[in-house]
C-alpha cells in the first residue's frame, strides 16, 4: 500500500513538475526588465528562450521572436537546449511510469517488470528536473553578469549630452517556475526510485523443495510476502499445491541468490 | 467614429480651481488610458499626465503632481482633470488625447481653454 | 526627463519640395524588447488639435498621406515630407514615448516659400 501510495505520489509529484517545466520553457519573462530605479516605466522590457517583448503604457503588448539561430548567444542555444531535453526525457518518463504504475493492470504484466519501469522512470524524471534546474540556473547566472556588466557601464557616462542608457534585466517569473517545477521533478523522480525498492525488495529466495508425503504429494514453493522481483512467476504469492511431486529440474526455472538442496 | 468632447472655455482668479471634462465616445472606454496635454499661447506641447479608466490608475507627470488631479467617471464615459491654486502660468488650452499603440496620442479633444486672470 | 530638441526651428519650402525635420533626443527610445523607436511625430495646424502623424518612428497613422515618411533610431530622428503640399503648412512635434515623463520637441514651423 505505502509502495502503490509512494508511486503514485512520485508520479502525481513528476506530473507536476514536468507542466512547469513546459511552462517555464515556453514563457516570456526569462528576464524582466530591473524597475528598481524607476517603478513606473512607459516600456516595459521582458525577454523569454524564444522571443523577447514590450508591454507599454498604453496598454499594447509587442512581441519579437528570435528568428535568427545562429546570431543568438551560445549561452542561449544551451539553455534552450537543456530545457528541451528535460522535457522529452520527463515525457518519456511520464509515459513510462503510468504503465508501471501498481494500480494499473496491463495484461499479465510481471512486477518484476513494472519495478523495473519504475526505476527508469524514475531516473528519467530525475535527469529531467536536473536539466530544468541547470537551464534556468545557467539563464539565471548568465543574468547576473549582464546585469553588473550594464550597471557599471551605466555610470560611465557618455561624456556628450546624449546618453545610451542600457536596459537592465533581472530575474522574470519564468526562472521560479522553472526551478520549482524541476525541483518537483527531482523529488517526484526519487519518490519513484523509492517506490522501485518497495516493489523489488533485497530477499532471499529459496529454491523450491519437494516433500514426499505419504499420501497427496506437495510442492512448497517458498514465496511468503514477496511482491515480485523479477526472479519469480508466481505472481499471486501463495503456496503452490499440486498433486504430483516436481522434478528439481522443472523447479529450477525459479532462480535465487542461495541454493539450498 | 473616435471622439473626445471636451468642455467649454473657462475664466478662473489665480488661487481658484477649475474642473475641465474630456467624453469619450465611438470605443471602448475602458481600454485605453487618456492622456492630458498643455499648450501655453504661442508655446509648445506639454504632458501633464495621464489616467486609465478601468481602475482609475495615474501616472503623473512630476511637475504637475501639486496641479492637477485625474478622475473617471465610467457611468458618463468621461475623464476629468481638477487644477487647483491656478496661477496666471496656468493660461493655457488643455487637450485630453487617447492613448494609442507606441504610447503615441491618436484622438484629441478639440482642447478647452482655461484663462487665469485677476 | 528626457530632453528632445527639434531642428530648425522653422523651415520655408517651395511647393512639392521636400522637406525635412530632424529631431535629436538626449536618451535612446530604441527598446531592446521590440526593437521598436519610441518616437511619434504630430502635425498642428492653427487653431486644431496635434493630429498623429507617424509613431514607432517610421509607422504611418491610417490616413496619413505617404509622402510623410519618418526614419531613424536610438536618438536620431528624420521626418521627411517628400513633396509639399500647401496644407502641409502647420508646426510638427516629435515626442517620446519611450518614458515618463512623456516629453516633446519645441516644434518646427513649416512654411511655404
Known amino acids: 500500500m505505502a509502495v502503490t501510495a509512494c508511486q503514485g505520489l512520485g508520479f502525481v509529484v513528476s506530473l507536476i513538475g514536468i507542466a512547469g517545466i513546459i511552462a517555464a520553457t515556453c514563457m516570456d519573462q526569462w528576464s524582466t526588465q530591473d524597475l528598481y530605479n524607476n517603478p513606473v516605466t512607459a516600456v516595459f522590457n521582458y525577454q523569454g528562450l524564444w522571443r523577447s517583448c514590450v508591454r507599454e503604457s498604453s496598454g499594447f503588448t509587442e512581441c519579437r521572436g528570435y528568428f535568427t539561430l545562429l546570431g543568438l548567444p551560445a549561452m542561449l542555444q544551451a539553455v534552450r537546449a537543456l530545457m528541451i531535453v528535460g522535457i522529452v526525457l520527463g515525457a518519456i518518463g511520464l509515459l513510462v511510469s503510468i504503465f508501471a504504475l501498481k494500480c494499473i493492470r496491463i495484461g499479465s504484466m510481471e512486477d518484476s517488470a513494472k519495478a523495473n519501469m519504475t526505476l527508469t522512470s524514475g531516473i528519467m524524471f530525475i535527469v529531467s528536473g536536473l536539466c530544468a534546474i541547470a537551464g534556468v540556473s545557467v539563464f539565471a547566472n548568465m543574468l547576473v553578469t549582464n546585469f553588473w556588466m550594464s550597471t557599471a557601464n551605466m555610470y560611465t557616462g557618455m561624456g556628450g549630452m546624449v546618453q545610451t542608457v542600457q536596459t537592465r534585466y533581472t530575474f522574470g517569473a519564468a526562472l521560479f517556475v522553472g526551478w520549482v517545477a524541476g525541483g518537483l521533478t527531482l523529488i517526484g523522480g526519487v519518490m519513484m526510485c523509492i517506490a522501485c525498492r518497495g516493489l523489488a525488495p533485497e530477499e532471499t529466495n529459496y529454491k523450491a523443495v519437494s516433500y514426499h508425503a505419504s499420501g497427496h504429494s506437495v510442492a512448497y514453493k517458498p514465496g511468503g510476502f514477496k511482491a515480485s522481483t523479477g526472479f519469480g512467476s508466481n505472481t499471486k504469492n501463495k503456496k503452490i499445491y499440486d498433486g504430483g511431486a516436481r522434478t528439481e529440474d522443472e523447479v529450477q526455472s525459479y532462480p535465487s541468490k542461495h541454493d539450498y538442496v | 467614429q473616435v471622439q473626445l468632447v471636451q468642455s467649454g472655455a473657462e475664466v478662473k482668479k489665480p488661487g481658484a480651481s477649475v474642473k475641465v471634462s474630456c467624453k469619450a465616445s465611438g470605443y471602448s472606454f475602458t481600454n485605453y488610458w487618456v492622456n492630458w496635454v498643455r499648450q501655453a499661447p504661442g508655446q509648445g506641447l506639454e504632458w501633464i499626465g495621464m489616467v486609465h479608466p478601468s481602475g482609475s490608475e495615474t501616472r503623473l507627470n512630476q511637475q504637475f503632481k501639486d496641479k492637477a488631479t485625474l478622475t473617471v467617471d465610467t457611468s458618463t464615459s468621461t475623464v476629468y482633470m481638477e487644477l487647483s491654486s491656478l496661477r496666471s502660468e496656468d493660461t493655457a488650452v488643455y487637450y485630453c488625447?487617447?492613448?494609442?499603440?507606441?504610447?503615441?496620442?491618436?484622438?484629441w479633444g478639440q482642447g478647452t481653454l482655461v484663462t487665469v486672470s485677476s | 526627463d528626457i530632453v528632445m530638441t527639434q531642428s530648425p526651428d522653422s523651415l520655408a519650402v517651395s511647393l512639392g519640395e521636400r522637406a525635412t525635420i530632424n529631431c535629436l533626443s538626449s536618451q535612446s527610445l530604441l527598446a531592446s524588447g521590440n526593437q521598436r523607436n519610441y518616437l511619434t511625430w504630430y502635425q498642428q495646424k492653427p487653431g486644431q488639435p496635434p493630429k498623429l502623424l507617424i509613431y514607432?518612428?517610421?509607422t504611418r497613422d491610417s490616413g496619413v498621406p505617404d509622402r510623410f515618411t519618418g526614419s531613424g533610431s536610438g536618438v536620431d530622428f528624420t521626418l521627411t515630407i517628400s513633396s509639399v503640399q500647401a496644407e502641409d503648412v502647420a508646426v510638427y512635434y516629435c515626442?517620446?514615448?519611450?518614458?515618463?515623463?512623456?516629453?516633446f520637441g519645441q516644434g518646427t514651423k513649416l512654411e511655404i516659400k
Open positions: 515626442q517620446n514615448g519611450f518614458s515618463f515623463p512623456f516629453t
Open positions: 488625447a487617447r492613448v494609442w499603440s507606441g504610447n503615441a496620442f491618436d484622438y
Open positions: 514607432w518612428a517610421s
